[in-house]
């Protein structure tokens, strides 16, 4: 069965800066990575970033840079500019859309023992959907 | 025929504000993405903030965030930008974009020029 | 951001000249690479998208190439209508983000 996992990490140097980091483990080519917070995209997460393998990518505020790191995981980076951190509390859903095997959801967040420069453990509350 | 019709530029003093709207016609408003561009005097081009088809996503460049609001009226088919504590590094022709999804900017508007001068 | 270089900003070319004006991005843009044309007084016209695919009605004496960080448009034969400047732009990685721009004049 194909699975997503999520990883959040806020950066060691930057407090208020963080990256999350998705990757899908299963057969098949990857169409499309949406990547949203505050919840799965469509049910309430706001969109952050949609990246293609072949057209590019598109981020929105707070994104930073939406970037594959290999054909089959992707990285974004996150900067918030307010004084407290609303994403250390914040989940991060990543919804890999794949052929054939179709869309495959999964969320994260950072855990709340985080200490910079340390990352989520990559098993995230998964939302596996095959839509 | 996709037709972008910028308006509302003009001269405004440093610190004072502006709004500029692009009426679009000859085509579905509401399922394109849609930018301003400027171009300033020097000729530099500079994307200025575009939004979603929804207008639920922004980007503004660093230039402009927190100075500058981009919005949309899908009913109306009308594109603004809201400009305010305007500087004279902000004077420039600015005109309306649209790209076509995940390629570039194949449609623009013929521009409207904001000059900021005491 | 990616940043978007065009090493000339101007040309004086003759009529009938083959006419070479290249563009280096800061990283890999993977081919998204769009030419644009500007006359005095218009908006911006898309002549290329893709760093190949030529948009209808563009004449076939232009043709664009390259891959990675680098990237050519050529004119074959510079025609009195080509006269203007020509505009990089990458649509890898939002923002999108322009070159500098190449005025062509006629010598």
């Known amino acids: 069965t194909p699975e997503v996992w999520v990883q959040v990490q806020m950066e060691a140097t930057e407090l208020s800066s963080f990256t999350v980091h998705c990757g899908f483990l299963g057969p098949g080519s990857i169409s499309l990575v949406t990547v949203s917070w505050g919840g799965p995209d469509g049910a309430g997460g706001t969109k952050l970033a949609v990246l293609h393998p072949e057209l590019g990518t598109r981020q929105w505020a707070p994104a930073r840079q939406a970037r594959w790191e290999t054909q089959s995981s992707i990285s974004l980076a996150l900067e918030d500019s307010g004084a407290s951190s609303p994403f250390a509390n914040t989940t991060f859903c990543c919804k890999f859309a794949s052929f054939p095997e179709g869309s495959w959801e999964s969320c994260g967040s950072l855990p709340p023992s985080s200490d910079p420069g340390l990352s989520a453990p990559p098993t995230p509350v998964p939302i596996l959907r095959a839509d | 025929e996709v037709k972008l019709v910028e308006s509302g530029g003009g001269l405004v003093q440093p610190g004072g504000s502006l709004k500029l709207s692009c009426v679009a016609s000859g085509f579905t408003f509401n399922t394109y993405i849609m930018s301003w561009v400027r171009q300033t005097p020097e000729k530099r081009l500079e994307l200025v903030a575009d939004i979603s088809n929804s207008g639920g996503n922004t980007y503004y460049s660093d230039t402009v965030k927190g100075r500058f609001t981009i919005s949309r009226d899908n009913a109306k088919n009308t594109l603004y930008l809201q400009m305010s504590s305007l500087k004279s590094e902000d004077t420039a022709m600015y005109y309306c974009?649209?790209?076509?999804?995940?390629?570039?900017?194949?449609?623009w508007g013929q521009g409207t020029l904001v000059t900021v001068s005491a | 951001d990616i940043q978007m270089t065009q090493s000339s900003s101007s040309f004086s070319v003759s009529l009938g000249d083959r006419v070479t004006i290249t563009c280096k991005a800061s990283?890999?843009?993977?081919?998204?690479l769009a030419w644009y044309q500007q006359k005095p007084g218009n908006a911006p016209r898309l002549l290329i998208s893709?760093?190949?695919s030529l948009e209808t009605g563009v004449p076939s004496r232009f043709s664009g190439s390259g891959s990675g960080k680098n990237y050519t448009l050529s004119i074959t034969s510079l025609q009195t209508e080509d006269v203007g400047t020509y505009y990089c732009?990458?649509?890898?990685?939002?923002?999108?983000?322009f070159g500098g721009g190449t005025n062509l004049e006629i010598k």
């Open positions: 893709g760093a190949t």
């Open positions: 974009a649209r790209p076509d999804n995940w390629d570039p900017f194949v449609y």
């Open positions: 732009q990458q649509h890898w990685s939002t923002p999108w983000t």
């Open positions: 990283e890999d843009i993977y081919a998204r």
